[in-house]
């Protein structure tokens, strides 16, 4: 069995379309290099949202592109998911390689269900 | 055992916190009076949200001053709880019972988690 | 498609240098630590070294500690196997890999002879 | 140079079952993960079962793994041609502190 990642099994969405939560693994090493990645479950398909590695000193970065920001503290990692919309809710898992020095290790969460709202249009103003 | 009750286990209110749910029941009879109880739980309390009888011939009617409306069909009741807001996030059970002819029977589903998201305020129009 | 191909090998004379070259394509290779392997003639997998993704640290088996040196450019998305001192036994083909062992490349021969 | 124990050669028929053994120590497989390669002649090893003894991309259902102590077994079932090749194991050994390999198992499919 691969390392345990836990995150949480729901997260509502905002209104405007952002979604945070928290990845937690389990390392007995102190990894220095660190990659985390965003997968969408749907059916039994995986699409990858985003990706980072970070290292233990520095913050965690993404693609300036990506629809995901994040930090990292010690073995947790606040992940933030933007832009999303109602027919985004879906499984969210949460993978996490322990990437260097060796030896490399590797966890999935269960998925965090993200639910998304779509807001009413606000009126027109006159 | 009761009467089985079942009902979604989740179910997301509108931006404009309207949640709707089916609420069904198992009967061997033919009732021609049913109750309708939406509860919500949190930690081990269960507070009544609204409440409704109903006959087979006439539609389902909530109380003026209620958060709900329903209609009803057979054995399958629509819920739609109203005004809801994030903080009314939780579980809501819905309890049937068989008032009349006897036997009396009461089954309550396992629950259905409502989300609800507050919508972020409109701009104000300059 | 991901894609990692060694160069630089040759037939080169005990106590000899040389430099191998991994260039990779189609993925953020800056987001990947790496390793090198080798594999000689008739024998099993062996790990040489590995490096961050940044090029900031490194780490090496014993029987190559002293003598071979990676580096990295991530400009060029290609890590670097330095090798001196060279001995016979050091003949093997060598191959780069990414560090979560997802990719391998298909391998360039060192050939240490006189 | 290596340290995780391999059969030279096994060998099975199209459509059959074959098991390939790694028996370690409990400095490394005794008390860390097992990864497989398959490599095919002229080419750099393939990752056919990751170090979280999930299979990796692309890789069918008829690879398994399993590992009772200080031996990992790898079985191929439904035999195919293009399973001809050679295949090593590796895990992490936690008195060495590094990577170790088996030797290689070359598997050779039978007319």
């Known amino acids: 069995k691969g390392m345990h990642v836990a995150q949480p099994a729901v997260v509502l969405a905002s209104s405007r379309g952002v979604a945070s939560f928290v990845c937690e693994y389990g390392s007995s090493g102190n990894a220095a290099e660190v990659r985390v990645t965003v997968l969408r479950q749907a059916g039994s398909q995986m699409t990858e949202v985003c990706a980072a590695t970070y290292t233990v000193e520095d913050e965690l970065a993404f693609l300036d592109d990506s629809t995901c920001t994040g930090t990292s503290s010690g073995n947790k990692v606040n992940l933030t998911i933007q832009g999303l919309r109602a027919m985004d809710t879906g499984l969210y898992i949460c993978k996490v390689e322990l990437m260097y020095p060796p030896p490399y290790y590797v966890g999935m969460g269960n998925g965090t269900q993200i639910y998304v709202i779509d807001p009413e249009p606000c009126p027109d103003s006159d | 055992k009761g009467m089985h009750v079942a009902q979604p286990a989740v179910v997301l209110a509108s931006s404009r916190g309207v949640a709707s749910f089916v609420c069904e029941y198992g009967s061997s009879g033919n009732a021609a009076e049913v109750r309708v109880t939406v509860l919500r739980q949190a930690g081990s309390q269960m507070t009544e949200v609204c409440a409704a009888t109903y006959t087979v011939e006439d539609e389902l009617a909530f109380l003026d001053d209620s958060t709900c409306t329903g209609t009803s069909s057979g054995n399958k009741v629509n819920l739609t709880i109203q005004g809801l807001r994030a903080m009314d996030t939780g579980l809501y059970i819905c309890k049937v019972e068989l008032m009349y002819p006897p036997p009396y029977y009461v089954g309550m589903g396992n629950g259905t988690q409502i989300y609800v998201i507050d919508p972020e305020p409109c701009p104000d129009s300059d | 498609e991901v894609q990692l191909v060694e160069t630089g090998g040759d037939l080169v004379k005990p106590g000899g240098s040389l430099r191998l070259s991994c260039v990779a394509s189609?993925?953020?290779?800056?987001?990947?630590?790496m390793n090198w392997v080798r594999q000689a003639p008739e024998k099993g997998l062996q790990l040489v070294g590995g490096?961050?993704?940044?090029?900031?640290?490194?780490y090496y088996t014993d029987a190559v500690k002293g003598r071979f040196t990676i580096s990295r450019d991530n400009a060029k998305n290609t890590v670097y196997l330095q090798m001196n001192s060279l001995r016979a036994e050091d003949t093997a083909v060598y191959y780069c890999a990414i560090s979560n062992w997802a990719y391998w490349g298909q391998g360039t021969l060192v050939t240490v002879s006189s | 140079q290596a340290v995780l124990n391999q059969p030279a050669s096994v060998s099975g028929s199209l459509g059959q079952r074959v098991t390939i053994s790694c028996t370690g120590s409990?400095?490394?497989?005794?008390?860390?993960?097992v990864a497989w390669y398959q490599q095919l002649p002229g080419t750099g090893p393939r990752t056919l079962i990751n170090?979280?003894?999930n299979r990796a991309s692309g890789v069918p259902d008829r690879f398994s793994v399993s590992r009772s102590g200080n031996t990992a077994t790898l079985t191929i079932s439904g035999l195919q041609a293009e399973d001809e090749a050679d295949y090593h194991c590796?895990?992490?050994?936690?008195?060495?502190?590094?990577?170790?390999f088996g030797s290689g198992t070359q598997l050779t499919i039978l007319g």
């Open positions: 189609g993925f953020s290779f800056s987001s990947y630590a």
């Open positions: 590796s895990s992490w050994d936690w008195s060495l502190h590094t990577y170790v």
């Open positions: 409990s400095s490394d497989i005794g008390k860390s993960y």
């Open positions: 490096i961050n993704s940044g090029g900031s640290s490194t």
């Open positions: 170090v979280d003894g």
